[in-house]
Each structure stands twice: as structure tokens, then as C-alpha cells.
């Protein structure tokens, strides 16, 4: 008995060939001996089966002795043994229809679980293997689960169903809803304008939701809301913004925030949360702000940074084109009685400069002591 695997919703063509290469009488029946279709001369006739409106044949092939049964929009319950009766012969074809669906939705939030469920006919014992867009293989039976979806899991998942040494392939497009970056850090000199951007890693026709940027300033004892907003069909409208700092928000995607000036009291870290329509859970992106200030007070030249810096970052003070006068893994460095000239304060990571602030030290003219 020949075995043919089909996919739910697809079309299958079951073949039946006569030894004579001409149009002769044939019938297709199911295992209950109910006629599905056949011919009467050059006419196609249909029986009382459940497949009535979905069954067809290819009349153009009859003259060549081929009498296929075409079943459209396959259903799991179409799985059966189909019998072709031609020239006093019976050809049996076992059709097994499988379906593979993703749980609830193919648009899932980062960190959520993806469950793929295999629909299969009674009595079958298929095995399933799926390959993710990043090449990860998962195997299972009726259900396959992937926990903690990552951004790289977005794309086409290819799943192969194996039954009776035959295989059928399914392709499922999964969209992982996430920000492009889980975390970002902005380095700014005091007084500079700060731009925060929160690009999404997916595109959808309509995007509706709401969000908030919640901020913990390093120098503040508690965190607070900096801005709340709504998103309607990709249009952003600000709901409420704190008075200090007075943030501005772009009206279009990607989500974009502007802080008029970087000040030490704003340095810290924030969490932008976005709730999307028809989604359980929220998208998050962490954003960090590091602010640098270089000052000269009397005979003391000081450079300070505020905000979340890693312990391996180096803060240095150096006179232009000279070796660093002071270099420490600390958040403040200073030089007493600095020489005149252009001084540079540098925040660097393994030699790479992340932030630089220049300050000019003027020469101090010592007034001669009067006799």
C-alpha cells in the first residue's frame, strides 16, 4: 500500500495509472467503499462522500491512462485509505494529513515560549524535528516547546514531520516582538543634548499600545516616571511628562526621546516599557546615561562622571599631547596646581575613548611682592 503525506489546508494529488494509455472507466472510493468520484465517458461523476465539493480529477490526463484524485483544502479527517478501481484492479493509497500550528499567535514577545502543536490522524505515530532561523534543532512528538524566545528566533521555522519513512515539511513564520537592543548606554558631557532611541526589531502594519520611561537617577533616593505615552497606529502621543527634566518625544516610530541637556542629576538608568495591543506581557529596553563634568576651582582641576559605569572604565586627566597626569578606575580624578594649557578629561574602556571633555587652564601670573 502506497503512503502519501499531506498538509492541512493544502492540495494533494493521489495517482492511479492504468496499463492502457487511454480513457477507460475508473472509480475512487474511500475505505468505507463510498464512491468519491469516477467517470462516465468523458464526464466526471461524483459520489456521496464528504469530499464532494473538494474532490476533483484531471480530465486532460485520462487519455494517457492517468486518473488522479485531487483533494483540495485538506483536513486531518481526510486521512484514510483511498481505493482506485480501474481495469478490474484496485490500487490502494493511504493518505495521512498533518497540521502544524503555533500556539495562539505567531507574533510573540521576547522571553515568551513558543509551542508548536502537531495535529495528526488517529493511529499515526509521527516524529517532528524543527529548525529555528538560527539553526537550533528541536525534536518532539505531538508538541514542541521553545522557552525564552530570543530576537534571533524571528524568521522561518522549518519543521519536518516523519511517518512511515515519508516526510512532509512545514514552514512557520515567527515574529519575535522586541527592541533591537536589550540595553544601551549614552555618554554625554554636561550640557550636551541627549538623544535616546528605542528602535523595534520588527515591523507590523498597525502598532497600538502604551508605554513609560521609568528613571532611577544615581543621585536620587527613589525612581520616578519621566514620560508616559500612547501609540496608535505607529503615531506617538505624549500622555504625561515630568517637569524636570522636560523630555521631548518624537511623534513617529522609532520611539525617540530628547533630553535638552545632560546634567549630573539626570545620570542613571531607565527602563522603557511598552505594552502592545493583544499581547500578554511587555517589551523592555534598559537605557543608561553617563554624564561627565570637568571643572576648575582655584588651584584644583577636577573631572567627574556620574551614572552607571563599569569598574574597568578608566578616568584620566591629561594635558593635550602629553602623557596622562592622573589615571584611575574611579568616578572622579583631579590635579592640583595644573599647568596652563588645554586639558582633556577622558573616560575610556581598554584604550577606547568613550567620552571626552576639554577645559582650558589659563596661566596664573604671580604678582611681584611690593617692597
Amino acid at each position: 500500500k502506497k503512503v502519501v503525506l499531506g498538509k492541512k489546508g493544502d492540495t494533494v494529488e493521489l495517482t492511479c495509472t492504468a496499463s492502457q494509455k487511454k480513457s477507460i472507466q475508473f472509480h475512487w472510493k474511500n475505505s468505507n467503499q463510498i464512491k468519491i468520484l469516477g467517470n462516465q465517458g468523458s464526464f466526471l461523476t461524483k459520489g456521496p462522500s464528504k469530499l464532494n465539493d473538494r474532490a476533483d480529477s484531471r480530465r486532460s490526463l485520462w487519455d494517457q491512462g492517468n486518473f488522479p484524485l485531487i483533494i483540495k483544502n485538506l483536513k486531518i479527517e481526510d486521512s484514510d485509505t483511498y481505493i482506485c478501481e480501474v481495469e478490474d484492479q484496485k490500487e490502494e493509497v493511504q493518505l495521512l494529513v498533518f497540521g502544524l500550528t503555533a500556539n495562539s499567535d505567531t507574533h510573540l514577545l521576547q522571553g515568551q515560549s513558543l509551542t508548536l502543536t502537531l495535529e495528526s490522524p488517529p493511529g499515526s505515530s509521527p516524529s517532528v524535528q524543527c529548525r529555528s532561523p538560527r539553526g537550533k534543532n528541536i525534536q518532539g512528538g505531538k508538541t514542541l516547546s521553545v522557552s525564552q524566545l530570543e530576537l534571533q528566533d524571528s524568521g522561518t521555522w522549518t519543521c519536518t514531520v516523519l511517518q512511515n519513512q515519508k516526510k512532509v515539511e512545514f514552514k512557520i513564520d515567527i515574529v519575535v516582538l522586541a527592541f533591537q537592543k536589550a540595553s544601551s548606554i549614552v555618554y554625554k558631557k554636561e550640557g550636551e543634548q541627549v538623544e535616546f532611541s528605542f528602535p523595534l526589531a520588527f515591523t507590523v502594519e498597525k502598532l497600538t499600545g502604551s508605554g513609560e520611561l521609568w528613571w532611577q537617577a544615581e543621585r536620587a533616593s527613589s525612581s520616578k516616571s519621566w514620560i508616559t505615552f500612547d501609540l496608535k497606529n505607529k503615531e506617538v502621543s505624549v500622555k504625561r511628562v515630568t517637569q524636570d527634566p522636560k523630555l521631548q518625544m518624537g511623534k513617529k516610530l522609532p520611539l525617540h526621546l530628547t533630553l535638552p541637556q545632560a546634567l549630573p542629576q539626570y545620570a542613571g538608568s531607565g527602563n522603557l516599557t511598552l505594552a502592545l495591543e493583544a499581547k500578554t506581557g511587555k517589551l523592555h529596553q534598559e537605557v543608561n546615561l553617563v554624564v561627565m563634568r570637568a571643572t576648575q576651582l582655584q588651584k584644583n582641576l577636577t573631572c567627574e562622571v556620574w551614572g552607571p559605569t563599569s569598574p574597568k572604565l578608566m578616568l584620566s586627566l591629561k594635558l593635550e599631547n602629553k602623557e596622562a597626569k592622573v589615571s584611575k578606575r574611579e568616578k572622579a580624578v583631579w590635579v592640583l596646581n595644573p599647568e596652563a594649557g588645554m586639558w582633556q578629561c577622558l573616560l575610556s574602556d581598554s584604550g577606547q575613548v568613550l567620552l571626552e571633555s576639554n577645559i582650558k587652564v589659563l596661566p596664573t601670573w604671580s604678582t611681584p611682592v611690593q617692597p
Epitope: T208, G209, S210, E212, W214, S222, K224, S225, T228, D230, K239, R240, T242, Q243, D244, T273, A275, E277, T280, G281, K282
Partner: antibody, heavy 119, light 107 residues
């Protein structure tokens, strides 16, 4: 520790006036929106009014518009509710509330002060 | 004004039971929904913000879901201290409005 302490409640005749005060401590009062929420005896909660950080924005429920005025004094860390032309239906426990929670949530509530409007 | 309708208005349950309270907004409010718990003679306590995010310190047996107009608060396994009245509140537009409350009573 965040603390909100209401005062000024009491018995007043219909048509009369009352001024509620709320003393705030344990947080930077001038950084937060503040609200008044009331609860009639045995009934549910009703938001009454709120005010932004510098007092420039104020919103009220329709039933108190033109009769109640919300105000604040950031130097004194105090929130006020001036209630005029009081009616029997204004009888309730009045709560002073901080709007400091994520997503505009009302995160800290005072213990409430009872206002009874009756002849 | 946006009307908030809670159901049921009261529910009798036993310790360990799963309790679900629903809240429906008369128009879409996105995720601007907060849940509060109030015990007799006490001020309300803030439980859940943005429809589904748990306020820190609130036990994980409490959970919220929903977006737009339909929201739910679920207590997965009722504890003795959970017998109280629960209110939903919208912060989408002024005037802010509360649901009428759902009283969770001991069966």
C-alpha cells in the same frame, strides 16, 4: 518612609465650606502629581481631583467642578482641597494620594479624613 | 467619562481557591489600568499597574491581564489575608474612574 496625613475633616452644614489639608513627608513632594480620592460610607472609591508638580495643571470630576479647588504649597510640602457649597452627597472619607506609581498609579494613600455634610 | 464595570460585585470563596475578577471599560484604555486592594477601615493598597505588572512586594499569586476594554485580576490560591474589596481604576483620561469594587468574602 512616605507619609501622607490628612486633616480638616468634620461636620458641616449643606452649603457650607471646609478646607482639607494633607501634610506630605518622606519624599520630594514637588516632584509628584497629587490627587484627592473620596469614599462615601459603605460605597466605592471616587477620584475627585489632581494637580501637577507646580500647580499649573488641575483636573476635577464633573460633580465637584466650580465648587472644589485643589492647590498645593511645595515650600510647606502640603496639598489642599477647598470645598465650597457642600452637599449631602459630598459626605465621604477623603484620601490624599500620591501619583508616584508606574503607569500613573496611585501608589501612596493617606489614612483619610471624614467629611460629613448634614443639617 | 469612561465607565468601569467590575464583576462579580461579590464572591464567596475558600482559602486555596482561584478567584477571578473582571473589569470592563466603556471605551479602550490601552494598558492604563491599575488594581487596588482595600480592607475595612483602611486606605486602598496598590497591587498591579499597566494591567499586568505586579507592584514590588505584592505576592506572585496575584496576576493581571488584558488590554483595551477587558481586564482580569486573578488570585491563584486565595490566602486568609486576601479577603478584601478589589477595585480597578483607569488612568487613560480624566476624570479617572474606578470600578464599583468586588468584595471577596469567606465562604
Amino acid at each position: 518612609e512616605v507619609q501622607l496625613v490628612e486633616s480638616g475633616g468634620g461636620l458641616v452644614q449643606p452649603g457650607g465650606s471646609l478646607r482639607l489639608s494633607c501634610a506630605a513627608s518622606g519624599f520630594t513632594f514637588s516632584s509628584y502629581w497629587m490627587s484627592w480620592v473620596r469614599q462615601a460610607p459603605g460605597k466605592g472609591l471616587e477620584w475627585v481631583a489632581n494637580i501637577n508638580q507646580d500647580g499649573g495643571e488641575k483636573y476635577y470630576v464633573d460633580s465637584v467642578k466650580g465648587r472644589f479647588t485643589i492647590s498645593r504649597d511645595n515650600a510647606k510640602n502640603s496639598l489642599y482641597l477647598q470645598m465650597n457649597s457642600l452637599r449631602a452627597e459630598d459626605t465621604a472619607v477623603y484620601y490624599c494620594v500620591r501619583e508616584g506609581g508606574q503607569w500613573l498609579a496611585l501608589d501612596y494613600w493617606g489614612q483619610g479624613t471624614l467629611v460629613t455634610v448634614s443639617s | 467619562d469612561i465607565q468601569m464595570t467590575q464583576s462579580p460585585s461579590s464572591v464567596s470563596a475558600s482559602v486555596g481557591d482561584r478567584v477571578t475578577i473582571t473589569c470592563r471599560a466603556s471605551q479602550g484604555i490601552s494598558s492604563w489600568l491599575t488594581w487596588y486592594q482595600q480592607k475595612p477601615g483602611k486606605a486602598p493598597k496598590f497591587l498591579i499597574y499597566a494591567a499586568s505588572s505586579l507592584q514590588s512586594g505584592v505576592p506572585s499569586r496575584f496576576s493581571g491581564s488584558g488590554f483595551g476594554t477587558d481586564f482580569t485580576l486573578t488570585i491563584s490560591s486565595l490566602q486568609p489575608e486576601d479577603f478584601a474589596t478589589y477595585y480597578c481604576q483607569q488612568a487613560n483620561s480624566f476624570p479617572w474612574t474606578f470600578g464599583q469594587g468586588t468584595k471577596v468574602e469567606i465562604k
